[in-house]
């Protein structure tokens, strides 16, 4: 099974070759590289010296290789770099090149979501609801789920909304949002709405939104 | 005058299933927020499900994924359909209309008992 690795969005994955070199091989005598699962070469280290001329435009001046790890550092990274990776070591002899080691690792690359942010979309309407937006962006993977919580003096609830989500094009990073419209389910001076952004790893929660209903007005007949 | 009357409570072993009904008059169901509570005795009520005015459903956090509130409009009727009920799930079921636009008045019915046996 691949080694699993994760890393960021914009920063930098350690995808290592994890080679004991038991026979205490010189990089003079070998010839490493890595590559994706289309094949596509990220890094040629031939005899001891890096090797451009086999890399892909993808992967150009965006890997760096330790030679005391054995393990190859992609930078600035992108979704689109997720997926597996092998580095492969062969032995050159007079006789041609054997393969003595391969290692395979699967790379998945996250990015947070920025905290959800509430954005009420009308006033207070006639003291009983509220209509409003939570969003957040820029994240990856898609989150799980995003819902609202209202809390009143004497109860909690959570009101699960129908999340809308984009992804961008070019980074295929994801916004996502919800809209709902929460009626107060109690007559209370004091209400505190929470937006909550639910992914396989985290809760994010927004700042409390807090509202002070007024008081109740007079039926229209009433004459003071 | 507005009168909501519940019912569907009873006796029901723990594992089981129930469906409150909330049927009212003088008022409608459409264009206002629904709300069933429960209280057991010595304790305050606590809200365990709404559903707003445009339809977003809400519910407390011990009964998330257990109960299920919804209405029939024409029938002027809210329901409670409650799955999985636990021995915690005992209480008087209230069922509330409100707080109405602008004068926030708020109706209740007269609850239904739902006791959860072993």
């Known amino acids: 099974a691949p080694l699993k690795i994760q890393a960021y969005f914009n920063e930098t994955a350690d995808l290592p070759c994890q080679f004991a070199n038991s026979q205490n091989q010189s990089l003079s005598e070998l010839v490493v590289f890595w590559q994706d699962q289309e094949n596509l070469v990220l890094n040629e280290v031939y005899l001891g010296k890096e090797k451009f001329d086999s890399v892909h435009s993808k992967y150009m001046g965006r890997t760096s290789f330790d030679s005391d790890s054995w393990t190859l550092r992609l930078h600035n990274l992108q979704i689109k770099d997720k997926g597996l990776y092998q580095c492969i070591i062969h032995h050159k002899k007079p006789t041609g090149m054997i393969r003595i080691h391969q290692m395979n690792s699967e790379l998945s690359v996250l990015a947070n979501f920025s905290q959800p942010e509430i954005v009420p979309i009308s006033n207070i309407t006639e003291n009983v609801y509220i209509n409003l937006t939570c969003s957040s962006i820029h994240g990856y993977p898609e989150p799980k789920k995003m819902s609202v919580l209202l809390r009143t003096k004497n109860s909690t609830i959570e009101y699960d909304g129908v999340m809308q989500k984009s992804q961008d094009n070019v980074t295929e990073l994801y916004d996502v949002s919800i809209s709902l419209s929460v009626s107060f389910p109690d007559v209370t001076s004091n209400m505190t709405i929470f937006c909550i952004l639910e992914t396989d790893k985290t809760r994010l929660l927004s700042s409390p939104f807090s509202i002070e209903l007024e008081d109740p007005q007079p039926p229209p007949d009433h004459i003071p | 005058e507005v009168q909501l009357v519940e019912s569907g409570g009873g006796l029901v072993q723990a594992g089981g299933s129930l469906r409150l009904s909330c049927t009212g008059s003088q008022i409608s169901f459409s264009d206002n927020t629904m709300n069933w509570y429960r209280q057991v005795p010595g304790k305050q009520r606590e809200l365990v499900a709404s559903l707003s005015i445009f339809g977003a459903t809400g519910y407390a956090d011990s009964v998330k994924g257990r109960f299920t509130i919804s209405r029939d409009i024409a029938g002027n009727t809210v329901y409670l359909q409650m799955n999985d009920l636990k021995i915690e799930d005992t209480a008087v079921y209230y069922c509330?209309?409100?707080?109405?636009?602008?004068?926030?008045?708020?109706?209740w019915g007269q609850g239904t008992q739902v006791t959860v046996s072993s």
């Open positions: 509330k209309l409100g707080p109405v636009r602008r004068s926030r008045l708020e109706y």
